[in-house]
């Protein structure tokens, strides 16, 4: 049994780090492998993660952690029974992928404006809470040529779009993702998308 692509891990800077790797051949990850992890810290214990399959030769493991601080460093050992396949380390603060924003809602009852709101995925006491900026993707299923990214660089998780910039009488979808500038993170996954119908019509005198 051999590791083809070494484990690569990202942290949500809250309670979970996700490690993914590829094996040399088809593997039943949960039955054959264990990823052991231990915080380099006085009297810390070794914890075990049972991986799941992620495609034929891919494995993924979700490491449960306490809150993350910048000093944290983990040792990682990938075992197949009594055989050590790989040994490495992981510093969560240097490999952060934020959680995806949630509760994306579209408010169309605001005059002349489409208002999108969503929730910050972190509690106020988390370091990332005040560091997230967002990208909102809006596209139309009726008009495949239409797709826009709106960068939200302020803290408030809202975006206002003049309804007049969207075509009337067709449906749109929106989704949002986040990143944290000062932590040099990757982008989060996209939130689930939300659909709405743009019924806005310009006043008669403006037509």
């Amino acid at each position: 049994m051999k590791v083809l692509q070494e484990p690569a891990c990202v942290s949500d800077y809250m309670s979970i780090s996700t490690c993914e790797w590829k094996m040399g051949g088809p593997t039943n990850c949960s039955a054959e492998l264990r990823l052991l992890y231990q915080l380099v810290f006085q009297s810390s214990e070794t914890h075990t993660c049972v991986p799941e399959n992620n495609g034929g030769v891919g494995c993924v493991c979700h490491l449960l952690m306490d809150d993350v601080v910048s000093m944290d460093n983990y040792t990682l050992d990938l075992w197949a029974g009594q055989q050590l396949l790989w040994k490495g380390s992981f510093k969560p603060s240097e490999h952060v992928k934020p959680r995806a924003p949630g509760n994306l809602t579209v408010h169309t009852n605001v005059s002349d404006t489409v208002l999108l709101t969503w929730s910050n995925p972190y509690p106020p006491d988390n370091y990332l809470y005040n560091d997230l900026t967002y990208a909102v993707n809006i596209w139309s299923e009726n008009d495949p040529a239409y797709s826009r990214i709106h960068n939200v660089t302020y803290l408030k998780p809202t975006l206002r779009i003049p309804a007049s910039t969207l075509k009337s009488g067709i449906s749109y979808r929106a989704r949002v993702r986040a990143w944290a500038q000062h932590y040099n993170t990757t982008w989060s996954e996209w939130s689930p998308s939300t659909k709405w119908y743009n019924s806005y019509r310009e006043p008669f005198e403006q037509r």
């Epitope: 810290f41 009297s43 810390s44 914890h47 000093m71 944290d72």
Partner: antibody, heavy 125, light 112 residues
Framework: EVQLVESGGGLEQPGGSLRLSCAGS????????MTWVRQAPGKGLEWVSS????????YYADSVKGRFTISRDNSKNTLYLQMNSLRAEDTAVYYC??????????????????WGQGTTVTVSS | DIVMTQSPLSLPVTPGEPASISCRSS???????????VDWYLQKSGQSPQLLIY???KRASGVPDRFSGSGSGTDFTLKISRVEAEDVGFYYC?????????FGQGTKLEIK
Amino acid sequence: EVQLVESGGGLEQPGGSLRLSCAGSGFTFRDSAMTWVRQAPGKGLEWVSSISGSGDNTYYADSVKGRFTISRDNSKNTLYLQMNSLRAEDTAVYYCAKDRLSITVRPRYYGLDVWGQGTTVTVSS
Amino acid sequence: DIVMTQSPLSLPVTPGEPASISCRSSQSLLYSIGKNYVDWYLQKSGQSPQLLIYLGNKRASGVPDRFSGSGSGTDFTLKISRVEAEDVGFYYCMQALGSPYTFGQGTKLEIK
């Protein structure tokens, strides 16, 4: 009531051996790391050794490394310190203390919040 | 190893007056925001040490509120707002960031 009771101290000749015990009660023993601290006559406190809750991880002061062995039996709620190749400078009161909660990924630290009454070790010919 | 240096080593105090003991570490004991791995212990004559303050500023259970801990990084202070006769003994700071744990030399607090 949370309590630690040491035993096993006594008079021993240089080069000899002693085994100290520390019985814990009133708390979930296996969840806590444990520590030994000693105090030579008229001197300050000196850390000797620590062990994680499971017993998998042990730590020693340079002055005792290779001579002392810390261990625990969680089924008996008991901590041990096996002392071999004793020297005159090992003469001290030995205290066991409850250390950090080590069941969480990052052990939770509340200080050495419970101490035993101490057991006296005298090494002399 | 981290060296812990206490001062003063002897502290005569009048009952009812405040007292302050300083402890300096040879390297930072700050692990994360608000968490400095330094403790303060009191050892009364003929007794085992007892925990007063942990993580720099957290008062242990049952410890009177006249005891307080402060400081961050490498400089720490134990303050007693009004010394009482029962407070006499040796006070030790200890770093618990990692092994080897190291103690200060001890400060002897006595009543004038």
